[in-house]
């Protein structure tokens, strides 16, 4: 699987992983460059409460991962909240999912050795018009 | 922002831990779960009451090279009649992810972890109304 900047050998026939064009393992600066001012999603916005498709945030903690805490969204209702504050089942609350990269300690418990891991998180919910299947 | 050391006392540093120079860490960029796929409901970006578009950002010095960013199409939300209702707001939902940046330091190449804020989609919210005294 070849991506920008780093090429990952897939089999023994691939070029030597020590070749500068094919690093499988890299040494990375411990300081993470952070261009964002984002923190805990509960603090940064209250969209999860004000949304017409509100959600609850569940804390997912894993000390073997960086970041160790990830907040997972779960839609509160199947339907959406209408102008009267009631659940309208003609509409659907659906999760918005995103693949993110995290660091997994590898070997386990090692303080400064990691592997990239792709995980799927539900970030929030949105209100959609349902797909109606007409039965012939 | 430094990556915290393992905090739990029962996590003794195993003998098998690789030696790492000070101020850096060893990172294997062979991704765990590389082939997992998002199984979101079909084209929710168009069916949402707060619809959004996608823009692919491409950076040859970043891993992964492509990061998809969403942008809300409207300020308001789409009502049952398909019209924009500006009494409600379309707002972006964001999530941080890690990327690896390949950089040049003099004649050598180095790698830096970077946090990138990804706009994943949009949701429709009731606006916060500020009453002026």
């Amino acid at each position: 699987i070849v991506k920008a900047g780093i090429t990952i050998p897939r089999n023994p026939g691939c070029p030597n992983s020590e070749d500068k064009n094919f690093p499988r393992t890299v040494m990375v600066n411990l300081n993470i460059h952070n261009r964002n001012t984002n923190t805990n999603p509960k603090r940064s916005s209250d969209y999860y409460n004000r949304s017409t498709s509100p959600w609850n945030l569940h804390r997912n903690e894993d000390p073997e991962r960086y970041p160790s805490v990830i907040w997972e969204a779960k839609c509160r209702h199947l339907g959406c909240i209408n102008a009267d504050g009631n659940v309208d089942y003609h509409m659907n609350s659906v999760p918005i999912q995103q693949e993110i990269l995290v660091l997994r300690r590898e070997p386990p418990h090692c303080p400064n050795s990691f592997r990239l891991e792709k995980i799927l998180v539900s970030v929030g919910c949105t209100c959609v018009t349902p797909i109606v299947h007409h039965v012939a | 922002r430094k990556i915290p050391k393992v905090g739990h006392t029962f996590f003794q540093k195993p003998e098998s831990c690789p030696p790492v120079p000070g101020g850096s860490m060893k990172l294997d960029i062979g991704i765990i779960n590389e082939n997992q796929r998002v199984s979101m409901s079909r084209n929710i970006e168009s069916r949402s009451t707060s619809p959004w578009n996608y823009t692919v950002t491409w950076d040859p010095n970043r891993y992964p090279s492509e990061v998809v960013q969403a942008q809300c199409r409207n300020l308001g939300c789409i009502n049952a009649q398909g019209k924009e209702d500006i009494s409600m707001n379309s707002v972006p939902i964001q999530q941080e992810t890690l990327v690896v940046r390949r950089k040049h330091q003099g004649c050598s190449v180095s790698f830096q972890l970077e946090k990138v804020l990804v706009t994943v989609g949009c949701t429709c919210v009731t606006p916060v109304i500020h009453h002026v005294q």
Epitope: V2, K3, A4, G5, I6, T7, K20, N21, F22, R35, N36 | T55, T57, W58, D59, P60, N61, R62, S65, E66, V67, Q69, Q71, V99, R101, R102, K103, H104, C107, V109, E114, K115, V116, L117, V118, T119
Partner: antibody, heavy 117, light 106 residues
């Protein structure tokens, strides 16, 4: 001295192909991503395509996707742009540019491509 | 599609004056970087500023970049005769260029 020299431009009929080359010198070519940027007569700059240091990743502008292919030969310190199904709107001065992670820091003098019947 | 809008289209100033060029992005993305280039007639573009505010090698300190989010500015503190040219902003990552601002002698 860091230098980029483009070649391969010329007059070509619509629908035909052309291959541009860029010879790099004065820097470690295989350490850097490279790009093609064009400028139509009297107009602004338009990014065309880019390629990572090891050819592992390539990017294209929507206007050329499926028609143009970027490639590089690190052993020859060369960058290429294969342009197929050329259109009149592809007429421009094509620049080769070196990537310095946050911007394009070295540019060639350009090669002119004219698409006309 | 991301659009970078530069203003004004043309700036008529005298040598020694201060020039302020604006670049507004239709969208702001984390992990995108803004750069400024100078182009003189018949010449290739030249990098002035990268990552919003960092001066490229060999660029005089009268050139400075600032801004964040969607609004960015290139400032030339005291115009020299050689500074009269067209200036482009560019968003690295989305690969969009602004339409350019021409700085001409008044």
């Amino acid at each position: 001295e860091v230098q980029l020299v483009e070649s391969g431009g010329g007059l070509v009929q619509p629908g035909r192909s052309l291959r541009l080359s860029c010879a790099a010198s004065g820097f470690t070519f295989d350490d850097y991503a490279m790009h093609w940027v064009r400028q139509a007569p009297g107009k602004g700059l338009e990014w065309v395509s880019g390629i990572s240091w090891n050819s592992g990743s390539r990017g294209y502008a929507d206007s050329v996707k499926g028609r143009f292919t970027i490639s590089r030969d690190n052993a020859k310190n060369s960058l290429y742009l294969q342009m197929n199904s050329l259109r009149a709107e592809d007429t421009a001065l094509y620049y080769c540019a070196k990537d310095m992670v946050y911007a394009l820091d070295v540019w060639g003098q350009g090669t002119t491509v004219t698409v006309s019947s | 599609e991301i659009v970078l809008t530069q203003s004004p289209g043309t700036l008529s100033l005298s040598p020694g004056e201060r020039a302020t060029l604006s670049c507004r992005a239709s969208q702001s993305f984390s992990g995108s970087y803004l750069a400024w280039y100078q182009q003189k007639p018949g010449q290739a573009p030249r990098l002035l500023i990268y990552d919003t505010s960092s001066r490229a090698t060999g660029i005089p300190d009268r050139f400075s970049g600032s801004g964040s989010g969607t609004d960015f500015t290139l400032t030339i503190s005291r115009l020299e005769p050689e500074d009269f040219a067209v200036y482009y902003c560019q968003q690295y990552g989305t690969w969009t260029f602004g339409q350019g601002t021409k700085v001409e002698i008044k």
